[in-house]
């Protein structure tokens, strides 16, 4: 295991999101992954940590107490309203995309550091293994946690949701590409407001950085609203342009990022390597997927999600 | 995941007091807002009271010196103290949690004011 936990460091350092064989695939517990795991396509909570205290709209309509309000928030990356290219919110709908590390590339040497295709392939092989492993041991944990202890009825604990719930919610929920990094879940609700009763809200946020990814998750109580929020594509939300699609559902054991579709292969320049959000964004995948040169120009590819 | 969990609504008499109590689980925010709303079948929700993690409240005309949100933070719970109800208080009324990222919604309870 030692070796394999060296090649897969190696991996990271080579990059190891290589395309083909060399390409991560996700397990996905249940229909979408536990709080924090980073894990868009299911109905669990996606692990934002920061918060920010703002009037929420339907306020402005109420007679609020005199008393100042410490104005808490936290910095985050504004995104110009009419700033050119896709911007943000290019995580695919359902999909188990990883977390957007800000700075650097895992490992990236610089300029110039092209190692051997095929080590790159069986290192990211390795590693990809691992990781299966590791979240097929984090699932069964799980499970007999969840079979050694359920709560005696009538004790509020927390809802676990069955796959078939899980699918069910995502039935009813959108998926908000392209939002505005400064955007609250408030705004959003109160963009959605017509469509129909909302049940919750999520701006996915960085696991590491805390800052929004651009893309957000609606549920709402029924499907008919989902319909009706479709007339929203591409309507304007803090002077962006958004993409609303249905939300898809992770199912358990499926690759969320193998999906079949054709790949686009261009060449992007990118020289800011110390921005969270320097890389280059293409569609609805954050990430560079392929393989990534480590010259000047990195070759890579993506996925429509439809 | 937030769970919201209202509970306290029944029949009372005008002129009579109801407590609504509503209980948020999971991984909540320390700062974030809880708040009452209401619903009559055919209408939107309408915004009751609402309170902010640092104390700070706000209600609705109509409610305004009858209703009293109450909100404590340790123990992730909002409460409404519904006095002097009258008749056109009857709705399903729903907790709210909202933060920066996230906003949750309970599934309501049943407030029926009626003689």
């Known amino acids: 295991m030692a070796a394999a936990a060296a090649a897969a460091a190696a991996a990271g350092a080579a990059g190891g999101r290589g395309s083909g064989p060399g390409r991560r695939r996700h397990l996905v517990p249940g229909a979408g992954g536990e709080a924090g795991e980073g894990a868009p396509g299911g109905a669990g909570d996606y692990g934002n940590g920061l918060e920010s205290e703002e009037l929420e709209p339907e306020e402005l309509l109420l007679e609020p107490e005199p008393e100042p309000e410490p104005e808490e928030e936290p910095p985050r990356p504004r995104a110009p309203p009419g700033a050119p290219g896709p911007g943000p919110g290019s995580g695919a709908p359902g999909s188990q995309e990883e977390e957007e590390e800000p700075g650097l590339v895992e490992g990236d040497p610089g300029d110039g550091a092209i190692e051997d295709p095929e080590l790159e392939a069986i290192k990211a092989r390795v590693r990809e293994m691992e990781e299966e492993a590791e979240k097929l041991k984090e699932l069964q944990n799980e499970v007999e946690k969840q079979m050694n202890m359920s709560p005696p009825p009538g004790n509020a604990g927390p809802v676990i949701m069955s796959i078939e719930e899980k699918m069910e919610a995502d039935a009813r929920s959108i998926y908000v590409g392209n939002v505005d990094y400064g955007a609250t879940a408030e705004e959003l609700e109160a963009h959605f407001h017509g469509c129909g009763s909302v049940n919750r809200v999520t701006i996915l946020c960085d696991k590491f950085s805390g800052h929004p990814k651009g893309f957000a998750y609606i549920e709402f109580s029924d499907k008919e609203s989902v319909r009706t929020s479709l007339a929203l594509d591409e309507s304007l939300f803090r002077g962006r342009q958004i993409k609303v699609i249905p939300k898809r559902t992770n199912r358990p054991g499926i690759s969320t990022t193998d999906r079949g579709f054709p790949r686009a292969r261009y060449r992007a320049r990118t020289t800011n390597y110390n921005s969270s959000r320097s890389r280059f964004y293409s569609g609805f995948n954050s990430r560079p997927r392929g393989r990534v040169y480590r010259g000047r120009a990195r070759a890579t590819s993506w996925y429509s999600p439809y | 995941e937030v769970q919201l969990v209202e509970s306290g609504g029944g029949l009372v008499q005008p002129g009579g007091s109801l407590r609504l109590s509503c209980v948020a689980s999971?991984?909540?925010?320390?700062?974030?807002?809880m708040a009452w709303f209401r619903q009559v079948p055919g209408n939107e929700r309408e915004l009751v009271a609402t309170?902010?993690?640092?104390?700070?409240?706000s209600y609705a005309g109509s409610v305004k010196g009858r209703f009293t949100i109450s909100r404590d933070n340790a123990k992730n719970t909002v409460d409404l103290q519904m006095n002097s109800l009258k008749p056109e208080d009857t709705a399903v009324y729903y907790c709210?949690?909202?933060?920066?990222?996230?906003?949750?919604w309970g599934q309501g309870t049943q407030v029926t004011v009626s003689s």
């Open positions: 709210k949690y909202s933060s920066r990222w996230n906003i949750y």
């Open positions: 999971g991984r909540t925010s320390r700062i974030s807002r």
């Open positions: 309170m902010s993690s640092s104390g700070i409240t």
